[in-house]
């Protein structure tokens, strides 16, 4: 089941999927001056069996100017966009994306692909948030969003990340920064939020990406 909406946006933050659930589609978009080859796929699809998942179809771009070539054209100034990179705050041990069963890893780039990727997510997909450069997390609650199906409709959970540009915040005296609460989430909340363990895993995963591409567009 495809998710109806995009993941929620958080002020001064970006999001990214670390792995993509089976059923996810990625549009085969080409950069300006290029187009999909005739009879080429419209999208890539994450498919798999119980032991292995991979992307079906290949995206291929060809020059719009000449028919049967994939010769690179010099991009116009407005096309020479830098992909924004955001440094994560603390490096941790990597978590292998492929170790998540039923998920595909980030597809490798194809020649002359567009600067932004458009994904169509499915129920159960999780995306992770981080503050953009120049902002810091005032509150770092669960910094992820999950696409869930409730009452026959899809809905993304609301991430509880607050990013602030204010460097001077007051921390109350005599109190150390507490660790994340050890108790599990109460029953009333489990239908809407992932577990603390999942959050810890995602933090480790997210923190491995020292400089990540965060211009990806999700739909």
């Amino acid at each position: 089941e495809l998710c109806d909406d995009d993941p929620p946006e958080i002020p001064h933050a970006t999001f990214k999927a670390m792995a993509y659930k089976e059923g996810t589609m990625l549009n085969c978009e080409c950069k300006r001056g290029f187009r999909r080859i005739k009879s080429g796929s419209l999208y890539m699809l994450c498919t798999g069996n119980s032991s292995h998942s991979s992307w079906d179809n290949q995206c291929q771009c060809t020059s719009s100017a000449t028919r049967n070539t994939t010769k690179q054209v010099t991009p116009q100034p407005e096309e020479q966009k830098e992909r924004k990179t955001t440094e994560m705050q603390s490096p941790m041990q990597p978590v292998d994306q492929a170790s998540l069963p039923g998920h595909c890893r980030e597809p490798p780039p194809w020649e002359n692909e567009a600067t932004e990727r458009i994904y169509h997510f499915v129920v159960g997909q999780m995306v992770y948030y981080q503050c953009v450069q120049g902002y810091r997390a005032l509150h770092r609650g669960p910094a992820e969003s999950v696409c869930k199906m409730t009452h026959g409709k899809t809905r993304w959970t609301q991430p509880q990340l607050i990013c602030t540009g204010e460097m001077e915040t007051s921390q109350f005296p005599g109190e150390e920064k507490p660790q994340a609460s050890p108790e599990g989430r109460p029953e009333s909340e489990t239908s809407c939020l992932v577990t603390t363990t999942d959050f810890q895993i995602q933090t480790e995963m997210a923190a491995t990406m020292e400089t990540s591409i965060f211009t990806t567009e999700y739909q």
Epitope: P11, R140, G141, Q171
Partner: antibody, heavy 115, light 107 residues
Amino acid sequence: QVQLVQSGAEVKKPGASVKVSCKGSGYTFTDYAMHWVRQAPGQGLEWMGVISTYSGDAIYAQKFQGRVTMTVDTSTSTAYMELSSLRSEDTAVYYCARGVTFDYWGQGTTVTVSS
Amino acid sequence: DIQMTQSPSSLSASVGDRVTITCRASQDISNYLEWYQQKPGKAPKLLVYNAKTLAEGVPSRFSGSGSGTDFTLTISSLQPEDFGTYYCQHHYDTPYTFGQGTKLEIK
């Protein structure tokens, strides 16, 4: 179910301080930041500030800077808002509200400042 | 600070009417906007978040739309229990300011 329960009404003299509490239950307290909002009689809503229940960091509205202190006690899942140097214009109902989208609110605490 | 301006400040409508309340931000706030309903003597209640997402348990006659600076809360068919004051609020940046409120009365 999620609940935010606030302390009872207070009557204070000008110049005094008041400390309002807000106890969260039915969810993991440190997952959600806590905002404080007040409403003077017959007036609209006014955002006072926000505190991270996880780190204790707080940001206050400029208007209250120097007079307000927000704290949390994670062992009791309680957030506090203390307002000092009270004046008659601080007479209002004070609310705590949870998370990025203020999805749950306390019932409100009436603070009356009168000589 | 970002100013939030609601209109109208009050309105009276009949049961079954379609009611629209607008909120304008003094600068672009993307879709970082919430709508709340408040009844006399009660705490506000979240209706819509992120401009268009209906909060859990809110009847489907309520809907939110808009992005950037102009936002709308619509009640498709007014019910007697919909009276009260409606507030918009942004969460783009601190301070998270509210609109001045729209008082809705049932004719």
